[in-house]
């Protein structure tokens, strides 16, 4: 979890003066309760922005909005705390709204918005935004938490960012794969332009379960220029196992921008249809 | 968490053998392909060989090293093995165990060979 960019982040508008801060997440209003605290943030909304760096990479953000509640406790709100938790790793950042003036009630609702988190393809995050102080330990609590999934390098525009063009998403092998007689199977895709290195990974499931039961993995040098682009076949060997019909079929570039860790691309066969047979009518009736 | 350890390696002159092994944490051993790379001194890192689930009957090989290495596993074990004769000087590198389906590493095992 980082946030985009150092430049100055503002936070400051009409009415309002305020600056953003790093945060250690432990806001002081924990460890020194104050009496009068504000209520919390209102209709918190989070939604996937992509934001460029000066450097010019493109990078998915979360961007985080939310409004206040029109009452009196806007008098004692003197900022607000924006926590990002990835759930996978536990990981968190905070950053915080510090008001360098007071709030004042004006014709329109408060609305406060922060787009600088940077957040990872297929991750899941909660996002919280706590008003500050926070409140005494047996108070109403003042924060609004929402979950956030980002999506996966899949999605049309996650596709050209900087981290999913790193990990491969530009490559689309589009993988074919055909049933052979003798127990094997022919996977075709188109090969990138790059001599790198491929592995080819067949696992193969029973009909209707999620527990493998063969796998092998077959590796692919890295082509000449003057394949790139081409197609690549593969005669692979399955297992004759009865049964052991579904098969899934990923492909692992090794590209120099992400080396162990680019993006899989997969297919899949599915068990033969069985015919429906009748049940056999005996022929003649036995009397006992 | 899967933890592959590998072992075995070390100073061999060339013409020598090692045995390196890689040990997996896991009881489902058996229903993983295996293989193992090598990353020698400024290179990317290379395949070596792989070994199919279960009874490991299908087995593949870098061009470099086919006839010299021998790969295979026990499963009772939880291990996978890499038998190298033949050594040269160019198969000098750190060998890592690898398990494609999640894409788990060892730390590796240093090879040196000498001439």
């Known amino acids: 979890l980082r946030l985009l960019d150092h430049r100055a982040l503002v936070c400051s508008q009409p009415g309002l003066n305020c600056t953003v801060k790093n945060s250690t997440c432990l806001d002081d209003s924990w460890i020194h309760p104050r009496n009068l605290t504000p209520s919390s943030p209102k209709d918190l909304q989070i939604q996937l922005h992509f934001a460029h760096t000066q450097q010019g990479d493109l990078f998915p953000v979360a961007h985080i909005e939310w409004t206040l509640q029109t009452d009196a406790s806007i008098l004692y709100l003197e900022g607000a705390e924006l926590s990002v938790l990835q759930l996978n790793t536990n990981e968190r950042l905070c950053v915080r709204f510090e008001f360098l003036s007071k709030l004042r009630h004006h014709h329109r609702r408060w609305r406060f918005t922060f787009s600088h988190f940077v957040v990872d393809p297929d991750q899941e995050y909660e996002v919280t935004v706590h008003h500050l102080p926070k409140p005494i330990p047996d108070g109403d609590p003042n924060h609004q938490s929402k979950n956030f999934l980002v999506p996966d390098c899949e999605h049309a525009r996650m596709k050209v960012t900087t981290p999913c063009m790193s990990s491969g998403s530009l490559w689309d092998p589009n993988i074919t794969v055909e049933t052979l007689e003798a127990h094997q199977l022919r996977v075709s895709f188109t090969l990138w332009n790059e001599s790198t290195h491929y592995q080819i990974l067949l696992t193969s499931f029973p009909h209707m379960e999620n527990h493998s039961c063969f796998e092998h993995m077959h590796h692919i040098p890295a082509p000449r220029p003057e394949e790139f682009h081409q197609r690549s076949n593969v005669t692979l060997t399955l297992r004759n196992l009865k049964g052991c019909c579904r098969h899934q079929v990923q492909i692992q570039p090794f590209f120099s921008s992400c080396l162990n860790d680019c993006l899989r691309h997969s297919a899949t066969v599915s068990c033969p249809e069985m015919p429906d047979t009748p049940e056999p009518i005996p022929d003649y009736m036995p009397l006992w | 968490e899967v933890q592959l350890v590998e072992s075995g390696g070390g100073l061999v002159q060339a013409g020598g053998s090692l045995r390196l092994s890689c040990v997996a944490s896991v009881s489902t051993f058996s229903l993983y392909s295996m293989a193992w790379y090598r990353q020698g001194p400024g290179n990317q890192r290379e395949f070596v060989a792989t070994?199919?689930?279960?009874?490991?009957?299908?087995?593949q090989y870098a061009d470099s090293v086919k006839g010299r290495f021998t790969i295979s596993r026990d499963n009772v074990k939880r291990t996978v093995y890499l038998q190298m004769n033949s050594l040269k000087p160019e198969d000098t590198a750190v060998y890592y165990c690898?398990?494609?389906?999640?894409?788990?590493w060892g730390k590796g095992t240093l090879v040196t060979v000498s001439s």
């Open positions: 690898n398990r494609p389906r999640d894409n788990y």
């Open positions: 070994i199919s689930s279960d009874d490991g009957d299908i087995i």
